[in-house]
């Protein structure tokens, strides 16, 4: 399977909400011995290898934000911790998974990474990630609403095995 990032750049005004999205593509094994671990984290834009370092989102680690389920099942993060920080990650039946961030501040700007780990019990793991940038802006140059920039077809299916 692959992870697609429909948008490579989100530009949002301060105070707005945004939902960053990744999509699981390709054949997904729905067997009982397969589960999917999905999560989000930030990574420094200065890194040579994109998404190689896992940094927190609003003080929450990738462990705090993870979803764990089988196949294309729907799932949401535990509400208490994430929602206290204005965050919610979710996954639907169609392979889409997202993180919603409320009341954006400039400090939310940066590179966001979605990670999917296919776990086959008693076998190996398969890891793929997608990356997108969020720029939060303020002042006269800031848009009135979030503006999204589509990934090129090559970028949108760009995957890296971890």
């Amino acid at each position: 399977f692959k992870v697609a990032t429909p948008y490579s750049l989100y530009v949002c005004p301060e105070g707005q909400n945004v939902t960053l999205t990744c999509r699981l593509l390709g054949p997904v094994d729905k067997g009982h011995d397969v589960t999917f671990y999905k999560t989000w984290y930030r990574s420094s834009r200065g890194e040579v290898q994109t998404c190689s370092e896992r940094r927190p989102i609003r003080n929450l680690t990738f462990q705090d934000l993870h979803l764990h389920h089988g196949g294309h099942q729907a799932a949401n993060t535990s509400h208490d911790l994430a929602q206290r920080h204005g965050l919610e990650s979710a996954s639907d039946h169609h392979g889409n998974f997202s993180i919603t961030m409320r009341n954006l501040t400039l400090l939310d700007s940066g590179l966001y990474c979605c990670l999917v780990v296919e776990i086959r019990h008693h076998h190996s793991e398969h890891r793929v990630h997608g990356a997108m940038e969020l720029q939060v802006q303020t002042g006269k140059d800031a848009p009135s609403n979030c503006v999204v920039y589509p990934s090129s077809s090559q970028d949108s299916e760009n995957i890296t095995a971890a």
């Epitope: 301060e14 200065g46 940094r55 003080n59 400090l107 939310d108």
Partner: antibody, heavy 119, light 106 residues
Amino acid sequence: QVQLQESGPGLVKPSETLSLTCAVSGYSITSDYAWTWIRQPPGKGLEWIGYMMYSGSASYNPSLKGRVTISVDTSKNQFSLKLSSVTAADTAVYYCARFDHYYGRFDYWGQGTTVTVSS
Amino acid sequence: AIQLTQSPSSLSASVGDRVTITCSASSSVSYIHWYQQKPGKAPKLLIYEISKLASGVPSRFSGSGSGTDFTLTISSLQPEDFATYYCQQWNYPLFTFGQGTKLEIK
């Protein structure tokens, strides 16, 4: 190694505008992080003035009542502070620093420059 | 905004002493960082994320705590450790500094 270096006049007259520049080497300020100004009045603690994100937007300490502007010169890899309508209360050592906004820490600092507001 | 209170505000100690500085937050915080500032110098990151030593910091420095109460400990004071120490909290999206603790030679 990331290095920051402040420069600017050490003496500013009351009601005038204080202008300082921070030159950064070893890292591109448009790559990542928040680039900040912090000051320390004589014998006192540290006060955050404001920061500019790598993407160009800035945020300021509300206590400075709109007197602050932080701007960037990407061609020289430096960012600047302007503080208008200064008074003796703005006398301080001014530091520029890199703010790691992932973990909320100031990981690299300039050596500081002393600015005295006096006629 | 979360307030940080350091205690003591000043402290006299001798070389070889074990010293503890505390930092209390007015409500729970995610991260605490500690800085050391010597006279005429910029602050230097000493300990980050409560207990991690910054690059080049000697192992005699340690940090601990959680929630609202945090400590910086120097296990055996060296002459170069006499300085002012600041704690700083990070609770997205705000940060604040403590008022500082001045460590002087007895």
